[in-house]
Protein backbone atom coordinates (compact mmCIF):
# COMPACT_ATOMS: atom_id res chain seq x y z
CA UNK A 1 0.00 0.00 0.00
CA UNK A 2 2.99 2.36 0.85
CA UNK A 3 4.76 1.37 -2.59
CA UNK A 4 0.95 2.15 -4.53
CA UNK A 5 0.53 5.22 -2.79
CA UNK A 6 4.52 6.46 -3.83
CA UNK A 7 4.33 5.18 -6.94
CA UNK A 8 0.85 7.07 -7.78
CA UNK A 9 2.37 10.81 -5.85
CA UNK A 10 5.56 9.63 -8.25
CA UNK A 11 3.25 9.79 -11.48
CA UNK A 12 1.67 12.85 -10.60
CA UNK A 13 4.27 14.50 -9.89
CA UNK A 14 5.39 13.36 -13.73
CA UNK A 15 2.53 14.91 -15.17
CA UNK A 16 3.38 18.23 -13.80
CA UNK A 17 6.43 18.31 -16.07
CA UNK A 18 5.37 16.81 -19.06
CA UNK A 19 4.66 19.84 -21.15
CA UNK A 20 7.78 21.16 -21.46
CA UNK A 21 9.68 17.57 -20.33
CA UNK A 22 8.62 14.16 -22.08
CA UNK A 23 11.24 12.59 -20.41
CA UNK A 24 13.17 12.45 -17.51
CA UNK A 25 16.65 10.84 -16.44
CA UNK A 26 16.47 9.89 -12.85
CA UNK A 27 19.09 8.66 -10.41
CA UNK A 28 18.58 7.01 -7.48
CA UNK A 29 20.04 9.62 -4.33
CA UNK A 30 21.92 7.77 -2.06
CA UNK A 31 20.96 3.64 -0.82
CA UNK A 32 17.25 4.51 -0.07
CA UNK A 33 15.72 3.35 -3.05
CA UNK A 34 12.64 6.05 -2.29
CA UNK A 35 14.47 8.96 -3.48
CA UNK A 36 14.76 9.86 -6.71
CA UNK A 37 16.59 13.01 -8.67
CA UNK A 38 15.78 13.70 -12.32
CA UNK A 39 16.55 16.20 -14.99
CA UNK A 40 14.92 16.50 -18.14
CA UNK A 41 16.37 14.23 -20.98
CA UNK A 42 18.99 15.67 -21.68
CA UNK A 43 19.91 18.31 -19.82
CA UNK A 44 23.37 17.23 -17.37
CA UNK A 45 23.45 17.58 -14.16
CA UNK A 46 25.88 18.77 -11.31
CA UNK A 47 25.16 18.88 -7.67
CA UNK A 48 21.11 20.04 -6.95
CA UNK A 49 20.65 21.48 -10.43
CA UNK A 50 20.00 20.90 -14.22
CA UNK A 51 21.60 22.37 -16.91
CA UNK A 52 20.74 23.48 -20.75
CA UNK A 53 22.99 24.73 -23.23
CA UNK A 54 20.17 26.56 -25.63
CA UNK A 55 21.92 27.03 -29.08
CA UNK A 56 19.32 29.39 -30.08
CA UNK A 57 20.31 32.63 -30.70
CA UNK A 58 18.41 35.16 -28.73
CA UNK A 59 18.40 38.66 -26.82
CA UNK A 60 19.16 38.19 -23.07
CA UNK A 61 15.14 39.04 -22.20
CA UNK A 62 14.02 36.43 -24.91
CA UNK A 63 16.93 33.61 -23.39
CA UNK A 64 15.57 34.36 -19.80
CA UNK A 65 11.41 33.72 -21.05
CA UNK A 66 13.32 30.86 -22.86
CA UNK A 67 14.61 29.29 -19.60
CA UNK A 68 11.19 30.24 -17.97
CA UNK A 69 9.17 28.66 -20.20
CA UNK A 70 11.39 25.26 -19.54
CA UNK A 71 10.67 25.68 -15.45
CA UNK A 72 14.37 27.16 -15.33
CA UNK A 73 15.96 30.74 -15.18
CA UNK A 74 19.53 31.51 -16.97
CA UNK A 75 22.16 30.00 -14.42
CA UNK A 76 23.18 31.62 -11.20
CA UNK A 77 26.89 30.41 -11.03
CA UNK A 78 27.44 30.18 -7.21
CA UNK A 79 31.39 28.58 -7.22
CA UNK A 80 34.48 28.21 -9.43
CA UNK A 81 33.33 23.89 -9.34
CA UNK A 82 29.93 24.88 -10.75
CA UNK A 83 31.39 26.92 -13.58
CA UNK A 84 34.49 24.18 -14.25
CA UNK A 85 31.45 21.32 -14.43
CA UNK A 86 29.45 24.56 -16.82
CA UNK A 87 32.20 24.79 -19.54
CA UNK A 88 32.92 21.37 -19.85
CA UNK A 89 29.36 21.50 -22.19
CA UNK A 90 30.68 24.87 -24.14
CA UNK A 91 31.96 25.34 -27.11
CA UNK A 92 35.02 27.89 -27.45
CA UNK A 93 33.95 30.15 -30.48
CA UNK A 94 30.43 30.99 -28.75
CA UNK A 95 29.12 33.14 -26.70
CA UNK A 96 26.57 32.32 -23.58
CA UNK A 97 24.16 34.27 -21.52
CA UNK A 98 24.09 34.18 -17.86
CA UNK A 99 21.55 34.93 -15.26
CA UNK A 100 23.63 38.41 -14.18
CA UNK A 101 22.03 41.81 -15.95
CA UNK A 102 22.77 45.72 -14.63
CA UNK A 103 19.31 46.73 -15.55
CA UNK A 104 20.21 50.48 -14.62
CA UNK A 105 23.60 50.47 -16.09
CA UNK A 106 24.86 51.71 -12.71
CA UNK A 107 26.84 48.11 -12.68
CA UNK A 108 24.71 46.89 -9.55
CA UNK A 109 24.65 43.75 -11.04
CA UNK A 110 21.81 41.18 -10.13
CA UNK A 111 21.42 37.83 -10.31
CA UNK A 112 17.95 36.52 -11.52
CA UNK A 113 17.27 34.52 -8.91
CA UNK A 114 17.77 37.52 -6.42
CA UNK A 115 20.98 35.45 -5.44
CA UNK A 116 23.09 37.91 -3.55
CA UNK A 117 25.94 39.59 -6.25
CA UNK A 118 29.34 38.44 -4.21
CA UNK A 119 32.17 40.41 -6.00
CA UNK A 120 34.45 37.80 -4.23
CA UNK A 121 32.30 34.69 -6.30
CA UNK A 122 32.67 36.64 -9.89
CA UNK A 123 34.66 35.13 -12.27
CA UNK A 124 35.25 38.49 -14.92
CA UNK A 125 37.50 38.37 -17.59
CA UNK A 126 40.31 41.69 -16.82
CA UNK A 127 39.50 44.44 -17.80
CA UNK A 128 35.59 43.58 -17.34
CA UNK A 129 32.85 44.74 -16.93
CA UNK A 130 33.90 47.96 -18.71
CA UNK A 131 31.05 49.71 -20.48
CA UNK A 132 27.79 51.37 -18.56
CA UNK A 133 25.94 50.38 -21.93
CA UNK A 134 26.54 46.46 -21.99
CA UNK A 135 24.18 46.06 -19.14
CA UNK A 136 24.34 41.82 -19.54
CA UNK A 137 27.06 38.95 -18.55
CA UNK A 138 28.05 36.12 -20.83
CA UNK A 139 30.60 33.80 -20.56
CA UNK A 140 32.90 33.35 -23.17
CA UNK A 141 36.36 32.16 -24.33
CA UNK A 142 40.09 34.15 -24.36
CA UNK A 143 42.62 32.27 -25.33
CA UNK A 144 44.49 34.35 -22.83
CA UNK A 145 42.27 33.98 -20.17
CA UNK A 146 40.54 31.14 -21.16
CA UNK A 147 36.72 30.82 -19.82
CA UNK A 148 35.27 34.25 -17.92
CA UNK A 149 32.92 36.38 -18.14
CA UNK A 150 32.02 39.69 -20.25
CA UNK A 151 29.59 42.46 -20.29
CA UNK A 152 27.55 42.79 -23.47
CA UNK A 153 24.67 44.98 -24.91
CA UNK A 154 21.44 43.03 -23.64
CA UNK A 155 19.73 43.03 -27.33
CA UNK A 156 22.78 41.19 -29.19
CA UNK A 157 21.34 38.04 -29.46
CA UNK A 158 23.78 34.79 -27.76
CA UNK A 159 23.44 30.99 -27.19
CA UNK A 160 22.56 30.35 -23.21
CA UNK A 161 22.31 28.48 -20.27
CA UNK A 162 19.53 27.67 -18.58
CA UNK A 163 19.41 26.14 -15.21
CA UNK A 164 16.80 24.45 -12.64
CA UNK A 165 16.42 22.88 -9.47
CA UNK A 166 16.72 18.78 -9.62
CA UNK A 167 13.11 17.51 -9.84
CA UNK A 168 12.83 14.83 -6.88
CA UNK A 169 10.57 11.87 -7.15
CA UNK B 1 15.46 63.61 -33.95
CA UNK B 2 16.62 60.34 -34.72
CA UNK B 3 18.31 60.11 -38.11
CA UNK B 4 19.70 56.80 -39.94
CA UNK B 5 20.99 58.30 -43.45
CA UNK B 6 22.28 55.64 -45.92
CA UNK B 7 24.72 55.88 -48.57
CA UNK B 8 23.60 56.13 -52.80
CA UNK B 9 22.90 53.57 -54.97
CA UNK B 10 25.30 51.10 -56.25
CA UNK B 11 25.77 49.14 -59.35
CA UNK B 12 28.23 46.11 -59.33
CA UNK B 13 29.73 43.39 -61.50
CA UNK B 14 28.95 39.41 -59.92
CA UNK B 15 31.54 38.77 -57.72
CA UNK B 16 32.08 41.87 -56.88
CA UNK B 17 31.95 43.10 -52.97
CA UNK B 18 29.66 46.31 -51.77
CA UNK B 19 29.58 48.19 -48.79
CA UNK B 20 26.60 50.21 -47.92
CA UNK B 21 26.64 52.77 -44.92
CA UNK B 22 24.46 53.89 -42.52
CA UNK B 23 25.25 57.36 -40.54
CA UNK B 24 23.42 57.96 -37.34
CA UNK B 25 22.32 61.09 -35.56
CA UNK B 26 19.89 62.06 -32.95
CA UNK B 27 20.68 59.93 -30.39
CA UNK B 28 23.65 57.85 -28.33
CA UNK B 29 24.95 56.06 -31.31
CA UNK B 30 27.26 52.97 -28.88
CA UNK B 31 23.47 52.75 -27.03
CA UNK B 32 21.39 51.03 -29.57
CA UNK B 33 22.10 48.05 -31.94
CA UNK B 34 21.60 48.34 -35.78
CA UNK B 35 19.91 45.63 -38.25
CA UNK B 36 20.43 45.59 -41.43
CA UNK B 37 17.34 43.91 -43.55
CA UNK B 38 16.88 44.00 -47.77
CA UNK B 39 14.21 43.87 -50.02
CA UNK B 40 14.66 42.28 -53.80
CA UNK B 41 12.15 44.14 -55.99
CA UNK B 42 8.86 43.51 -55.52
CA UNK B 43 9.51 41.21 -53.32
CA UNK B 44 9.39 41.04 -49.43
CA UNK B 45 11.57 41.36 -46.25
CA UNK B 46 14.67 39.52 -45.13
CA UNK B 47 16.81 39.98 -41.94
CA UNK B 48 20.33 39.91 -42.53
CA UNK B 49 22.18 40.43 -39.22
CA UNK B 50 22.75 42.90 -36.31
CA UNK B 51 25.79 44.86 -35.14
CA UNK B 52 26.24 46.53 -31.68
CA UNK B 53 28.03 49.87 -32.46
CA UNK B 54 30.04 49.80 -29.01
CA UNK B 55 31.58 47.39 -28.64
CA UNK B 56 31.45 45.52 -32.52
CA UNK B 57 29.56 42.49 -31.42
CA UNK B 58 27.86 40.81 -34.40
CA UNK B 59 25.35 38.03 -35.11
CA UNK B 60 24.06 37.75 -38.93
CA UNK B 61 21.55 35.67 -40.53
CA UNK B 62 23.54 31.74 -41.46
CA UNK B 63 22.00 32.34 -44.96
CA UNK B 64 24.56 34.92 -45.78
CA UNK B 65 27.14 34.06 -43.54
CA UNK B 66 31.00 34.22 -44.99
CA UNK B 67 29.67 37.03 -47.50
CA UNK B 68 28.24 39.80 -44.82
CA UNK B 69 30.50 41.54 -42.75
CA UNK B 70 29.27 44.58 -40.79
CA UNK B 71 31.39 46.99 -38.75
CA UNK B 72 31.10 50.39 -37.75
CA UNK B 73 33.37 53.57 -37.18
CA UNK B 74 32.54 55.46 -33.85
CA UNK B 75 34.02 58.76 -34.37
CA UNK B 76 31.80 58.99 -37.51
CA UNK B 77 28.71 57.15 -35.88
CA UNK B 78 28.92 55.44 -39.12
CA UNK B 79 27.59 51.38 -39.25
CA UNK B 80 28.23 49.26 -42.83
CA UNK B 81 27.62 46.52 -44.38
CA UNK B 82 29.70 44.66 -46.89
CA UNK B 83 28.76 41.65 -48.87
CA UNK B 84 30.81 39.90 -51.14
CA UNK B 85 30.45 37.49 -53.88
CA UNK B 86 27.51 39.08 -55.28
CA UNK B 87 25.38 37.70 -57.31
CA UNK B 88 22.17 38.71 -59.32
CA UNK B 89 19.69 37.18 -56.91
CA UNK B 90 21.48 40.17 -54.44
CA UNK B 91 19.60 42.90 -56.39
CA UNK B 92 17.69 44.46 -53.70
CA UNK B 93 17.47 47.38 -51.49
CA UNK B 94 19.19 47.76 -48.11
CA UNK B 95 17.80 48.79 -45.13
CA UNK B 96 19.42 49.48 -41.77
CA UNK B 97 17.38 49.99 -38.93
CA UNK B 98 17.66 50.38 -35.00
CA UNK B 99 16.33 48.45 -32.67
CA UNK B 100 15.07 50.80 -30.11
CA UNK B 101 14.85 50.06 -26.16
CA UNK B 102 11.41 47.67 -26.74
CA UNK B 103 13.66 45.03 -29.02
CA UNK B 104 11.43 46.47 -32.30
CA UNK B 105 13.04 48.26 -35.39
CA UNK B 106 11.98 51.94 -34.67
CA UNK B 107 13.47 54.15 -36.76
CA UNK B 108 14.73 52.90 -40.33
CA UNK B 109 17.44 54.47 -42.94
CA UNK B 110 15.95 55.05 -46.42
CA UNK B 111 17.85 52.15 -48.22
CA UNK B 112 20.20 51.53 -50.76
CA UNK B 113 19.69 49.67 -53.67
CA UNK B 114 22.32 47.45 -55.07
CA UNK B 115 22.20 46.66 -58.50
CA UNK B 116 24.33 43.60 -59.64
CA UNK B 117 24.41 42.84 -63.60
CA UNK B 118 27.58 41.70 -66.30
CA UNK C 1 14.63 28.73 -37.87
CA UNK C 2 11.17 30.34 -37.22
CA UNK C 3 8.81 30.79 -40.41
CA UNK C 4 6.36 33.24 -40.63
CA UNK C 5 3.04 32.59 -43.49
CA UNK C 6 1.20 35.83 -43.77
CA UNK C 7 -2.58 35.84 -45.31
CA UNK C 8 -3.79 36.83 -47.52
CA UNK C 9 -0.91 38.49 -49.61
CA UNK C 10 -3.12 40.60 -51.16
CA UNK C 11 -6.45 42.32 -50.55
CA UNK C 12 -9.19 44.71 -52.15
CA UNK C 13 -11.08 46.53 -50.00
CA UNK C 14 -13.03 50.44 -49.75
CA UNK C 15 -12.93 53.57 -47.60
CA UNK C 16 -14.47 52.94 -44.07
CA UNK C 17 -14.14 48.35 -44.42
CA UNK C 18 -12.70 46.49 -41.65
CA UNK C 19 -9.67 44.81 -42.69
CA UNK C 20 -7.98 41.82 -40.75
CA UNK C 21 -4.57 40.00 -41.87
CA UNK C 22 -2.88 37.08 -40.18
CA UNK C 23 0.18 35.87 -39.34
CA UNK C 24 1.26 32.11 -38.59
CA UNK C 25 4.52 31.52 -36.93
CA UNK C 26 5.52 27.80 -37.35
CA UNK C 27 6.52 28.19 -33.53
CA UNK C 28 5.55 29.36 -30.12
CA UNK C 29 6.68 32.90 -30.60
CA UNK C 30 5.60 34.14 -27.34
CA UNK C 31 3.89 37.31 -28.49
CA UNK C 32 7.12 38.94 -29.57
CA UNK C 33 6.02 40.62 -33.41
CA UNK C 34 5.68 43.33 -34.79
CA UNK C 35 3.43 44.85 -37.51
CA UNK C 36 4.57 47.17 -40.41
CA UNK C 37 3.33 49.34 -43.22
CA UNK C 38 5.26 49.78 -45.94
CA UNK C 39 4.75 52.25 -48.90
CA UNK C 40 6.18 52.14 -52.88
CA UNK C 41 9.58 53.71 -52.81
CA UNK C 42 10.07 53.86 -48.53
CA UNK C 43 11.16 52.14 -45.84
CA UNK C 44 9.15 49.83 -43.52
CA UNK C 45 6.82 52.31 -40.50
CA UNK C 46 6.23 50.38 -37.05
CA UNK C 47 2.80 50.13 -36.42
CA UNK C 48 2.67 47.67 -33.50
CA UNK C 49 5.16 45.41 -31.28
CA UNK C 50 4.80 43.01 -28.51
CA UNK C 51 1.61 41.53 -30.68
CA UNK C 52 -0.41 44.39 -29.26
CA UNK C 53 1.20 47.41 -28.81
CA UNK C 54 0.87 50.63 -30.75
CA UNK C 55 4.19 52.67 -31.53
CA UNK C 56 3.97 56.09 -30.91
CA UNK C 57 1.77 58.16 -33.33
CA UNK C 58 0.23 55.23 -34.54
CA UNK C 59 -3.84 56.10 -35.13
CA UNK C 60 -6.13 53.94 -33.05
CA UNK C 61 -7.62 52.51 -36.06
CA UNK C 62 -4.63 49.93 -35.78
CA UNK C 63 -4.80 46.80 -33.56
CA UNK C 64 -2.92 43.42 -32.98
CA UNK C 65 -3.78 40.29 -31.21
CA UNK C 66 -2.59 36.81 -31.03
CA UNK C 67 -0.60 34.55 -29.48
CA UNK C 68 1.19 31.34 -29.27
CA UNK C 69 1.49 31.03 -33.49
CA UNK C 70 -1.33 32.93 -34.17
CA UNK C 71 -1.40 36.77 -34.71
CA UNK C 72 -3.74 39.22 -36.21
CA UNK C 73 -3.12 42.77 -37.40
CA UNK C 74 -6.97 44.61 -37.61
CA UNK C 75 -7.59 47.96 -39.01
CA UNK C 76 -11.25 49.05 -37.74
CA UNK C 77 -11.89 51.61 -40.67
CA UNK C 78 -9.65 51.60 -43.39
CA UNK C 79 -8.79 55.38 -44.85
CA UNK C 80 -7.27 56.27 -47.81
CA UNK C 81 -3.58 56.67 -46.40
CA UNK C 82 -3.57 52.83 -45.02
CA UNK C 83 -3.26 51.76 -48.80
CA UNK C 84 -0.52 49.87 -48.51
CA UNK C 85 1.82 46.48 -48.02
CA UNK C 86 1.81 45.05 -44.31
CA UNK C 87 4.53 43.07 -43.03
CA UNK C 88 4.78 40.84 -39.96
CA UNK C 89 8.36 40.14 -38.03
CA UNK C 90 9.07 38.14 -35.33
CA UNK C 91 11.69 38.64 -32.78
CA UNK C 92 11.85 35.32 -30.88
CA UNK C 93 15.30 34.31 -32.48
CA UNK C 94 17.32 35.14 -34.98
CA UNK C 95 16.93 34.71 -37.69
CA UNK C 96 14.13 37.35 -37.26
CA UNK C 97 12.18 36.24 -40.47
CA UNK C 98 9.15 38.47 -41.60
CA UNK C 99 6.15 37.12 -43.47
CA UNK C 100 5.31 37.64 -47.03
CA UNK C 101 3.68 40.74 -46.89
CA UNK C 102 -0.24 41.60 -47.44
CA UNK C 103 -0.57 43.89 -50.62
CA UNK C 104 -4.05 46.25 -49.52
CA UNK C 105 -5.26 47.73 -52.39
CA UNK C 106 -8.57 50.09 -53.07
CA UNK C 107 -11.47 47.81 -54.66
Known amino acids: NFMYSKTVKRLSKLREYQQYHPSLTCVMEGKDIEDWSCCPTPWTSFQSSCYFISTGMQSWTKSQKNCSVMGADLVVINTREEQDFIIQNLKRNSSYFLGLSDPGGRRHWQWVDQTPYNENVTFWHSGEPNNLDERCAIINFRSSEEWGWNDIHCHVPQKSICKMKKIYI | QVQLVQSGAEVKKPGASVKVSCKAS????????IHWVRQAPGQGLEWMGTIYPGGGDTSYNQKFKGRVTMTRDTSTSTVYMELSSLRSEDTAVYYC???????????WGQGTLVTVSS | DIQMTQSPSSLSASVGDRVTITCRASGNIHNYLAWYQQKPGKAPKLLLYDAETLADGVPSRFSGSGSGTDYTLTISSLQPEDFATYYCQHFWSTPYTFGGGTKVEIK
Open chain 2, 26 to 33: GYTFTSYI
Open chain 2, 97 to 107: ARMGDNEYFDY
